[in-house]
Interface confidence: medium
């Protein structure tokens, strides 16, 4: 297993609809054809695998398990979108990248993106 640098933004604020997007960029030492991206969440004394996708370079990311994640890839960048977030989902979201094929296997883990989620205030009743 060889180490690889992964960069991601420090802070992202989710939209009022509970959607947060950020870029996960990895410094690929070689020409990987198969890449696995996993998003981990660290908060509330929990470490959660939020979503995971394996993709072939140049193809769309396919996430598993009715995931709250979607994503696209472009070169050594993965554009990740996490949706359906609630205030309780606030936490540090860590991007983990694995170059699966061809060998050698590379692993990189980012420092994490702190995603803040604020539940929208309910609309006040209208008098009209």
């Amino acid at each position: 297993c060889k180490a690889m640098h992964v960069a991601q933004p420090a802070v992202v604020l989710a939209s009022s609809r509970g959607i947060a997007s950020f870029v996960c960029e990895y410094a690929s030492p070689g020409k990987a054809t198969e890449v696995r991206v996993t998003v981990l969440r660290q908060a509330d004394s929990q470490v959660t695998e939020v979503c995971a996708a394996t993709y072939m370079m140049g193809n769309e990311l396919t996430f598993l398990d009715d995931s709250i994640c979607t994503g696209t890839s472009s070169g050594n960048q993965v554009n990740l979108t996490i949706q359906g977030l609630r205030a309780m989902d606030t936490g540090l979201y860590i991007c983990k990248v694995e170059l699966m094929y061809p060998p050698p296997y590379y692993l990189g883990i980012g420092n994490g993106t702190q995603i803040y989620v604020i539940d929208p205030e309910p609309c006040p009743d209208s008098d009209f």
């Epitope: 969440r41 908060a43 509330d44 929990q46 959660t48 695998e49 939020v50 979503c51 995971a52 598993l64 398990d65 009715d66 995931s67 709250i68 996490i82 359906g84 977030l85 609630r86 309780m88 989902d89 936490g91 979201y93």
Partner: nanobody, 126 residues
Framework: EVQLVESGGQLVQAGGSLRLSCAAT????????LGWFRQAPGKEREFVAA????????AYADSVKGRFTISRDNAKNTVCLQMNNLKPEDTAVYYC???????????????????WGQGTQVTVSS
């Protein structure tokens, strides 16, 4: 509706291992994430681990990460919790529960789960 029945709890010495099992009956079992929680005497029920519908995604409490492993076998309708290097503070009643929503969540709280089993007692002696 899914029924959950836990088993495997017993008295074990510190440093030992146990494997808890949660057997499920019901057609929708394979569609939902499942979790393990525990409740020690005089304490609130707390999250231990969870696993997604297909078994590809997992969540762990910091206190058990690296010691406990959650897995599921959808062909046999079971979810297992392998507990290694047990500590006296792991003593509790362990409950299996079904997640309320089909989709995998980023966070795991008691309020996210319903349809609880009856629990199985794990006692770790020093």
């Amino acid at each position: 509706e899914v029924q959950l029945v836990e088993s495997g709890g017993q008295l074990v010495q510190a440093g030992g291992s146990l494997r808890l099992s949660c057997a499920a009956t019901g057609r929708t079992y394979n569609s939902y994430p499942l979790g393990w929680f525990r409740q020690a005497p005089g304490k609130e029920r707390e999250f231990v681990a969870a696993i997604s519908a297909s078994g590809t995604l997992r969540a762990y409490a910091d206190s058990v990460k690296g010691r406990f492993t959650i897995s599921r076998d959808n062909a046999k309708n079971t979810v297992c919790l392998q507990m290694n290097n047990l500590k006296p503070e792991d003593t509790a009643v362990y409950y299996c529960a079904q997640h309320r929503s089909v989709g995998w969540r980023a966070s795991h709280h008691l309020s996210d789960y319903d349809n609880w089993g009856q629990g199985t007692q794990v006692t770790v002696s020093s």
